[in-house]
Structure formats: C-alpha cells, structure tokens
C-alpha cells in the first residue's frame, strides 16, 4: 500500500485543527484523531515529525485491514490499540526527544480531516537556593524545559544567566545582592509550566558564609518541612488533552 499516493488522491482538506500541547516528561500522552467513524474512512495516517529525524508515518488502510510504518523507530510511540478499533496514538512514556509535530490524517471519500499537535515536552527543573557571599544569594533552576523564570522578594540587585544544554533543557541561575541591612530573609520564586516553587533563606551577616535553604536541591514535586516552600500545580501536568472542536 502506498499511503502517500492514496492520500494525494483525496487531497482536499475538509477540516484542519492544530493545537499546542505542553506535556510533562515521563507521563503518558494520548493524541486523538478527528471524530469520524471508521465506516466513513479509507485510510488513517499518523505523521510524526521529530527534530533531527526523518518523518515517521503510521498508516492503516481499512479496505485491506493493513497497517504500515515508514521511518518509525521509536517503540514508545504506538497505536493505542488496533487501528480498526481505536485510531488514537499513544506515547508511553513521554521523553524529551518527543518534542515535535504529530498529525492525524483521516482520508474519507470526499476529502481529508487533519488533527495536528505541536507537542512541547516539559521538564521540571531542580531548584536550589543558597547564600554564597555576604548578603548575596544564588537561586538555580537546573535543567528545566522550557527555561524557568526566577523572581525575588524583596527585589535586589540581580544578575541572571542561562545555560543551554544539548538535550534542550536550560539551567537558569539568578544571583542577587541586598545592600539594605534590614532585609534579613529573601524568597526566590521559580515559575515554570510544570508548577511554581518558592524557597526562602535567611541572609547571614558573616562574610564568606554559605548557607542553603532547607530542602534546597529537591525537585518541584517534593514537599518541604517548615513550610519554606509553596507548591502550585501548573497547567502542564495533565496526561490527556482537552480538545477544541
């Protein structure tokens, strides 16, 4: 079966919907096709375009009950079940390499229906807060995707650096100094699509002292003692997508 040739025979696009979908790494994701009954279909095709890889195609032809794959090497990306029973695609589990564009093409006798997903894999950064010099604190959000945002309460004299890693994650480092001596406690607030986290630390007056915030260095999902952290679940933690029709 040459699914490309057949798709071209029915190249009229009757409807196309594209959605951006942020999804947490290590969760399971299910991507859905348009709501069209199998009885109306000739071919179902999933096109998967991942960065730096040839386009992968998974196709099912109803007439022959035949499935075919082209350039598909990732065994974590599969049909949810037999395509004649469920045309959805699943990624179990989502890895950082699954960033890309996924499109379901449903070929009917009258034209095609497309449902596309721009999948953005989210990686929760590891957050640490410590004091490295007199009245200077360093807050780091390590290996997050996308880059986390760091803010301080109260505001200080701050410098922020970003370090980009080859796997697409970013480490954000914010170093702040407070000249005002009545500031004794500072809070680092890390905002990220996977959730938000706040750490605070008491500034030591002793020169050269190094002090870590309690619980610093743990992941965003951890619960910390003494309520030094506030955890707010972000919008990116859902396994399934709410569809827009």
């Amino acid at each position: 079966m040459d699914e490309k040739q057949i798709t071209q025979n029915y190249s009229k696009v009757l409807a196309e919907v594209n959605t951006s979908w942020p999804v947490k790494m290590a969760t399971n994701a299910v991507l859905c096709c348009p709501p069209i009954a199998l009885r109306n279909l000739i071919i179902i095709t999933w096109e998967i375009i991942l960065r730096g890889q040839p386009s992968c195609t998974k196709a099912y032809r109803k007439e022959t009950n035949e499935t075919k794959e082209t350039n598909c090497t990732d065994e974590r990306i599969t049909w949810v079940s037999r395509p004649d029973q469920n045309s959805d695609l699943q990624i179990r589990p989502v890895a950082i390499t699954h960033d890309g564009y996924y499109r379901c093409i449903m070929v009917t006798p009258d034209g095609n229906f497309h449902r596309g997903y721009h999948l953005q894999v989210l990686v929760t950064p590891e957050v640490t807060l410590f004091q490295n010099r007199n009245r200077t604190a360093v807050c780091k959000a390590v290996a997050g995707k996308p880059a986390a945002q760091i803010s301080w309460i109260p505001e200080g004299d701050c410098a922020t650096k970003q370090e980009y890693w080859s796997n697409g994650t970013v480490t954000v480092k914010s170093t702040c100094h407070w000249e005002v001596h009545n500031v004794s406690t500072v809070t680092c607030h890390v905002s990220h699509l996977t959730g938000n986290k706040s750490l605070y630390i008491e500034l030591l007056p002793v020169p050269g002292a190094k002090k870590s915030a309690k619980g610093g260095g743990s992941g965003l999902n951890d619960i910390f003692e003494a309520q030094k952290i506030e955890w707010h679940e972000g919008s990116g933690g859902h396994h399934h997508h709410h569809h827009h029709h």
């Epitope: 096709c33 069209i36 009885r39 007439e63 469920n86 009258d110 399934h240 569809h243 029709h245």
Partner: antibody, heavy 119, light 110 residues
Amino acid sequence: EVQLVQSGAEVKKPGASVKVSCKASGYTFTSYVMFWVRQAPGQRLEWIGYINPYNDDTKYNEKFKGRATLTSDKSASTAYMELSSLRSEDTAVYYCAREDYYGSRFVYWGQGTLVTVSS
Amino acid sequence: DIQLTQSPSSLSASVGDRVTITCRASKSVSTSGYSYMHWYQQKPGKPPKLLIYLASNLESGVPSRFSGSGSGTDFTLTISSLQPEDFATYYCQHNRELLTFGGGTKVEIK
C-alpha cells in the same frame, strides 16, 4: 444544495414487503453513508441500519436483521430500504438520513415515508 | 447497546422561560476526547433537525439560545429563552458504533 427525496406513502397488508427509495442530490452519492431510521406513532426514533455506497458495506440493527435489506443504485444516486414480513407494528414513518463525517451527525434527512400495515 | 434516558418526558413552559432537558447514557459516550452526543428538534410531520453536535457544538444556522453541555454519561440541552417556534419534541442521540435515540422530551405551551 443537498437534498434527500423519498418515495410516497405506502399501504401494505401483513406479511407483505415494502421498498422505500431515497434519491440523493447536491453531493457525490458514493461519498457518504446513508442511514435508515423509523418512527412509529408516539414512539422514539429507531435505527434500522446503514449502507455505505462507496463500498456497499451494510450494517443492521439486530432487531431488523433478516427482514430489512439496504441497497443502493449508484448510477441513480438512490438508496433503498426493503422491509419484508410486515406486521402492524411496522406502521411508521421511515426516514433516510445522510451521515456527515465530523461527529457522525445527521444534518440532512429525507422528508419521510409513511408505511401503513393494515389488513 | 447504549440506552439513552431523557428527562423529563414532557414539560410545559412559557415564552421567555429557560428550559433544560437532560439525557443520561447507560455507559459513557465520551471517547478520544470527544463526546458523541447530539441533540435534535422535531416538529409534527417533519424530520428531526440537528441543533447540537458532539455535546456542545452549535450546528450552523441554529439560534444561539440553544446550548449543550456534558460529558461521559450526563448531558444537557438548554434553551436560554424559549421562543414560540421552539415548542416541539427534542431528542438526544448517540452515534459512534450503533445509533441510539433518547425517548424524547415534548416541550408544550403552558
């Protein structure tokens, strides 16, 4: 404009057969599945079956299997529903309805054909 | 087979009233991110007319006073302000694999 025009009313005796036609226009007949639905007086709508003129696939409600036969004439863009061994409880209005792809919904219906079964 | 139970079976209302009709399925009609529930209006001697598809989508040309909601097994059709032409019978319908209709709700003039 999509139109589904059904044949006229029929009066039949118990045990007889009836064949209702549904002529489609305004679209490519073979591209869409045609459903048949009936409505007895004061009753809910009831699915009889469907035919896909693209490949002649048919599916029937278990209740009508063996009594209902769905066919189509592609050259005439017409779907047919034949019901045999008629009984009085088959007295109903019979509708054809085109299934639209997205959501499997029925936007276009025939006007209905009243079939009366009476001795 | 999925059974659809509509309530109430009939109701009396006045022009301008807000009307709510419910439909309960014997098992979930939601799959793959979509709810396969549609709503139709039928007047005597006429075929049904599609109002709402996939639970909440307004069919083209249908007045915005009609709305649908729900997922899983429980669905609702709402008419925000009943108009004289809205007195009719309303049916919910599921059509994923097998086609099923609810028993209907007749909306009458009070």
